[in-house]
């Protein structure tokens, strides 16, 4: 059974079917003989009792007050009274946006992480038996989906999925056609979970160099925002005035991670720079990854297989 209307403040859009269901419904069935009344008060009017004669748009069923449809002048306070039980709601009916398929103030926002499961199901359990068909729109363009009773989207989210999704239920009542719109503003955000950072390219790199020339050792990693990338070389970093660690450069990936690069520039290469390890490390809370570079004199290249040289 449809749950009762427990929210004390409700905003609805003019022109749509709407209902209020009080929260002592099971109790009301037990005491059928008890007098049950619905009242409305708005502005100057105090507690006017509602019944089908009040308006052709109003219907009363057991626990429910129905509007076919709700209109701007239905704004006000509503009361259900039964013996010593009273429930009150404040109803605000807002104007429909005539230039869009939905009204901005009646939108439910949802945030979905990219690549995570994303689902929209068009359901309306209260009016289910009256619904002829249901359509799903994205940014007010109809989506062609197989099921026209309960259209559904089930997929892994992509950034292209971001947008306003409107479920529009079409239903008949007393020979008139009505529709009910439920809109979701779907925002796709980057994956918030951390990755294990990884250095890009081969783990061991032999770099062919000439004495007296300069070389740039490129180190790049895919990492999280808080991870660090750094160079380690020699007994004590910074002891060689010809070695310069350039500023780190970061680029955000579409998944919300970062491509970080750090270049080690070695100027006026000397014998002391040859055949020693220059290590680039990426560190995170989850551990570290290291890749190594060894400078080799071009004349000695023949001794090393070609596939181990970097570009």
């Amino acid at each position: 059974a449809e749950s009762c209307t427990s929210r004390p403040h409700i905003t609805v859009v003019e022109g749509e079917p709407f209902y209020l269901k009080h929260c002592s419904c099971s109790l009301a069935h037990e005491i059928e003989t008890t007098t049950k009344s619905w009242y409305k008060s708005s502005g100057s009017q105090e507690h006017v009792e509602l019944n089908p004669r009040s308006s052709s748009r109003i219907a009363l069923h057991d626990c429910v007050l129905e509007f076919w449809p709700v209109e701007l002048n239905d704004t006000g306070s509503y009361f259900f009274q039964m013996k010593n039980y009273t429930q009150k709601w404040k109803l605000n009916v807002i104007r429909r946006n005539k230039h869009s398929c939905f009204t901005e103030r009646q939108v439910t926002s949802k945030i979905v992480e990219v690549k995570k499961f994303f689902q929209i199901t068009c359901e309306n359990s209260y009016y289910q038996t009256l619904v002829n068909s249901t359509s799903l729109y994205k940014n007010c363009k109809k989506l062609l989906l197989e099921n026209n009773k309960n259209p559904t989207i089930k997929k892994n989210a992509e950034f292209e999925d971001q947008g306003y999704y409107s479920c529009v239920h079409f239903l008949h009542h007393n020979g008139k056609l009505f529709n009910i719109t439920k809109t979701f503003n779907i925002t796709i955000v980057e994956d918030r979970s951390n990755i294990v950072p990884v250095l890009l390219g081969p783990k061991l790199n032999h770099v062919a160099v000439e004495l007296g020339k300069n070389v740039r050792l490129n180190c790049s990693a895919l990492l999280n925002e808080e991870d660090v990338i750094y160079w380690m070389f020699g007994e004590e970093n910074g002891s060689d005035p010809n070695i310069h660690e350039e500023k780190e450069m970061r680029i955000m990936t579409p998944e919300g991670k970062w491509h970080a690069s750090k270049v080690l520039r070695i100027e006026n290469i000397g014998e002391s720079n040859l055949n020693v390890l220059y290590n680039c490390t990426v560190a995170s809370t989850g551990g570290t990854d290291t890749k190594s570079f060894i400078l080799v004199r071009k004349a000695d290249m023949a001794d090393i297989p070609g596939h181990v040289f970097t570009r």
Partner: antibody
């Protein structure tokens, strides 16, 4: 100092392909210290990032969702340049197109190419 | 995507006055925010990156501050050549986006 020089036609017919090239001087398209972007500007859309290419042990390309199905950005290491191709253009694609280096931010901009889509 | 809202749309000031431009992000971009200056018929020029760092060759009268969602570009004393349109841009969320701009005009 780094400079970007753009070239390509200023008039493209609807449904055809917009093609622009950006020649890099003072830097390398395969540097680890930058990415190479295309950004466009129109009165209706303002400044809009379209996509980029960059090298980090391999080539990466990222594109804006709005043009993802129509765009290709290619590096050319032999000529030290990169190009933009935008397929199936409509009058909505009329804009000034810029090629831009991304270092600390979008730090070096080409001179811009006004592209009009019209029959 | 992140929406960057710049205010005011237009700022009318005289040379020598202080200009304060605001940029607000729809969600946090950490400190990954840049400011650009654009003059008619020219490409934008980078002024400030990562919220508060001046780009190479930018005069000290330009300064940036802020983090998270609220950022400010301050021009301490306007020079005649500073009258232009200023844009903010974020790279702390995917995809990179720009604000709509603030025009600083001569009063």
């Amino acid at each position: 100092q780094v400079q970007l020089q753009q070239s390509g036609p200023g008039l493209v017919k609807p449904s055809q392909t917009l093609s622009l090239t950006c020649a890099i001087s003072g830097d390398s398209v395969s540097t680890y210290s930058a990415a190479w972007n295309w950004i466009r500007q129109s009165p209706s859309r303002g400044l809009e990032w379209l996509g980029r290419t960059y090298y980090r042990s391999e080539w990466y390309n990222d594109y804006a969702v709005s043009v993802k199905s129509r765009i290709t950005i290619n590096p050319d290491t032999s000529k030290n340049q990169f190009s933009l191709q935008l397929n199936s253009v409509t009058p909505e694609d009329t804009a000034v197109y810029y090629c831009v280096r991304e270092g600390d931010a979008f730090d070096i901009w080409g001179q811009g190419t006004m592209v009009t889509v019209s029959s | 995507e992140i929406v960057l809202t710049q205010s005011p749309a237009t700022l009318s000031l005289s040379p020598g006055e202080r200009a304060t431009l605001s940029c607000r992000a729809s969600q946090s971009v950490s400190s990954y925010l840049a400011w650009y200056q654009q003059k008619p018929g020219q490409a934008p020029r980078l002024l400030i990156y990562d919220a508060s760092n001046r780009a190479t060759g930018i005069p000290a009268r330009f300064s940036g501050s802020g983090s998270g969602t609220d950022f400010t570009l301050t021009i301490s004393s306007l020079e005649p050549e500073d009258f232009a349109v200023y844009y903010c841009q974020q790279r702390g969320n995917w995809p990179p986006t720009f604000g709509g701009g603030t025009k600083v005009e001569i009063k």
